[in-house]
């Protein structure tokens, strides 16, 4: 089997990616400048550390989490890095254009990079549903469309529903999940005879996927607290996220054992279920008033995640063509919805407590926000899926799905790789 890209992709990818990069450089040249008002060097370091946590989550965490395929681990990690690098650049520009541009040039701060990294994370969550079935040229399209859709969604939600940075970014879980699932639905589904082994997991890649899950587990509190307004809110968010992910680990491992007839633990269940609590508390992590609530939420999320991992892959494999080990899409879609429901419940309690008398209105607004996120995710996902089906991108043949050798040069083409 040749390790070269098909000739057409060799022409298409470098030209497409480098032209795009040149365009981004020109946009940065004409429209951006650094924040000149930075006074506090200690503050700079603290702010950078949050951004660094997010980058570790994205590059190592999500990069390795998606690397469990027997013959697609290299591509998973490297393609994730490629998408992150491209996504961050476009997200910085887009956020600047949408929020600052009327007042002149886009001012780039460390916060801009933090926000852009979180936007790019959306793509890395979504792509789990399609990795192995698309080439880099197609992934470039996916990055551009998804980051643009998320940026516009956040702006619309901010303007119409008056939500803050944290709240409109926390729709990322639901948005990314439904975007990825709708893209996957558009792509060719059946795996031809003889290629089924490629979408199975192997021990060493599974270990690297577990490493990715561990990095995400460690840094999830940083993600959930990154955009909050006050030190107290950030502290609450860190604590609540930590309690939730701690409980979801215990639930994931014991629940996985419980779900197996022989009491064995499934690597696939554990990879995603350990993160369940972090996703479920994301929206309301700063609002949860006591640890036990966060822990209960982590428990419920862990159970939902294990249950979903047990019963949903069959359905997702048939309908969407998503392999059994790519469970992030439906996992995040269920847990994201759980998180949004918890937020609505807490919002009702807040409205009652404030003696506001407009509970129905507040709930309606929150449901409207969530519905808008799902609708935009589905529509932009379907659009992306249709774009990715165009012949121009020279998509890999179904027989070469989940195969590193299509994309990478290996000194020895070992079949069992």
């Amino acid at each position: 089997m040749s390790s070269k890209y098909p000739r057409s992709v060799r022409r298409c990818l470098p030209l497409w990616a480098l032209t795009l990069e040149a365009a981004l450089i020109l946009l940065f040249y004409f429209f951006t400048h650094y924040d000149a008002s930075l006074e506090d060097q200690k503050g700079l370091v603290a702010s950078y550390q949050v951004g660094q946590d997010l980058t570790v989550m994205a590059a190592i965490g999500l990069g390795f989490l998606t690397s469990s395929f027997r013959r697609h681990s290299w591509s998973s990690v490297a393609f994730n890095l490629f998408m992150l690098a491209l996504g961050v650049q476009w997200a910085i520009l887009l956020d600047g254009f949408l929020s600052q541009f009327p007042s002149g040039k886009v001012v780039i701060t460390l916060f801009s990079i933090r926000l852009a990294t979180m936007s790019a994370l959306s793509v890395l969550i979504s792509v789990d549903a399609v990795l192995g079935k698309v080439n880099l040229a197609q992934l470039v399209v996916m990055v551009l469309v998804e980051v643009t859709a998320l940026g516009n969604l956040r702006m619309v939600i901010s303007n119409i529903f008056n939500t803050d940075y944290h709240m409109n970014m926390m729709h990322i879980y639901v948005f990314a999940a439904y975007f990825g699932l709708s893209v996957a639905w558009c792509l060719p589904k059946p795996l031809p005879e003889g290629t089924e082994d490629k979408d199975q997991t192997a021990t060493i890649p599974s270990l690297s996927a577990m490493l990715g899950a561990l990095f995400l587990w460690m840094f999830w509190p940083s993600f959930n607290s990154a955009l909050l307004r006050s030190p107290i809110e950030r502290k609450n968010a860190v604590f609540n996220t930590y309690y939730a992910v701690a409980v979801s680990v215990v639930t994931a491992i014991s629940g996985s054992s419980l779900a197996h007839p022989q009491g064995k633990i499934s690597k696939t269940y554990v990879h995603s279920a350990v993160l369940a609590g972090g996703v479920a508390v994301g929206t309301s992590c700063h609002l949860i008033p006591s640890p036990w609530l966060a822990m209960v939420l982590g428990l419920v999320a862990g159970l939902i995640s294990v249950g979903g991992a047990k019963y949903l892959p069959g359905c997702c494999n048939r309908v969407l063509g998503i392999p059994h080990s790519s469970i992030m899409g439906y996992n995040f879609s269920l847990l994201g919805l759980l998180g949004e429901i918890i937020y609505i419940v807490l919002l009702v309690l807040d409205t009652v407590g404030a003696g506001n008398g407009m509970i129905g209105f507040q709930v309606l607004l929150s449901i409207g926000e969530l519905s808008l996120a799902i609708v935009i995710a589905l529509m932009s996902g379907l659009l992306t899926g249709l774009l990715l089906n165009l012949k121009i991108w020279k998509a890999p043949h179904e027989a070469k799905y989940f195969d590193d050798q299509v994309f990478w040069k290996f000194p020895h083409l070992a079949v069992g790789f």
Partner: antibody, heavy 127, light 107 residues
């Protein structure tokens, strides 16, 4: 005792720049958001800008966007307002104020308010 | 942007009177409303925050109420030192606008 002292005001020509400072003492400056509010002679209060506790987020009133920059140095307990392209109608007393927040019993979202104000510094924009 | 409209713009009352000032928001601000008092030549002082909580050190004759879009500042028994301009402010969403102010004079 919480104290906020504004300095840097004065007479400046239209189109020119000025930088205001607000020195804070008596509290942990790096834990609080800070605001600038102005008041034209004989007029009401007009909110100008806010900066979050860590300097990560800044918001401005539309009329000053792109011309004014709020910043802070937490190591020096100082808030700044860099004002460029000043206009005659921006003649005002500029106050800095500390933002505090509270969790009202029965609610879950923090509510914000300005609990301490400086005495203000007068900026006169005139040719 | 959220607009705040105070009424009346000015009023004159006698010592001992009960005085009410209202503040109406252009949309629901969910109790993110504060009241400030400013005397001539002084900086504003916080009186009431979160619509109804009295700031420590503020006289107990001041009280606040309201929810949604309509809020009220009440002085139960007017004192000579209450002569000032009162402002409401929303902190629901930036820009954090102030009302135009209500000037209170003592007869």
């Amino acid at each position: 005792e919480v104290q906020l002292v504004e300095t840097g005001g004065g007479v400046v020509q239209p189109g020119r720049s000025l930088r205001l400072s607000c020195a804070a003492s008596g509290f942990s400056f790096s834990n609080y958001g800070m605001h600038w509010v102005r008041q034209a002679p004989g007029k009401g209060l007009e909110w100008v800008a806010v900066i979050w506790f860590d300097g990560s987020i800044k918001y401005y009133v539309d009329s000053v966007k792109g011309r004014f920059t709020i910043s802070r140095d937490n190591s020096k307990n100082t808030l700044y307002l860099q004002m460029n392209s000043l206009r005659a109608e921006e003649t005002a007393i500029y106050f800095c104020a500390r933002e505090n927040s509270v969790l009202v019993p029965g609610t879950i979202r923090r509510r914000y308010y300005l609990d301490y104000w400086g005495q203000g510094t007068l900026v006169t924009v005139s040719s | 942007d959220i607009q705040l409209t105070q009424s009346p713009s000015s009023l004159s009352a006698s010592v001992g009177d009960r005085v009410t000032i209202t503040c109406r928001a252009s949309q629901s601000i969910s109790s993110y409303l504060n009241w400030y008092q400013q005397k001539p030549g002084e900086a504003p002082k916080l009186l009431i925050y979160v619509a109804s909580t009295l700031q420590s050190g503020a006289p107990s004759r001041f009280s606040g109420s309201g929810s949604g879009t309509d809020y009220t500042l009440t002085i139960s028994s007017l004192q000579p030192e209450d002569s000032a301009t009162f402002y409401c402010q929303q902190t629901y969403s930036p820009p954090y606008t102030f009302g135009q102010g209500t000037k209170l004079e003592i007869k």
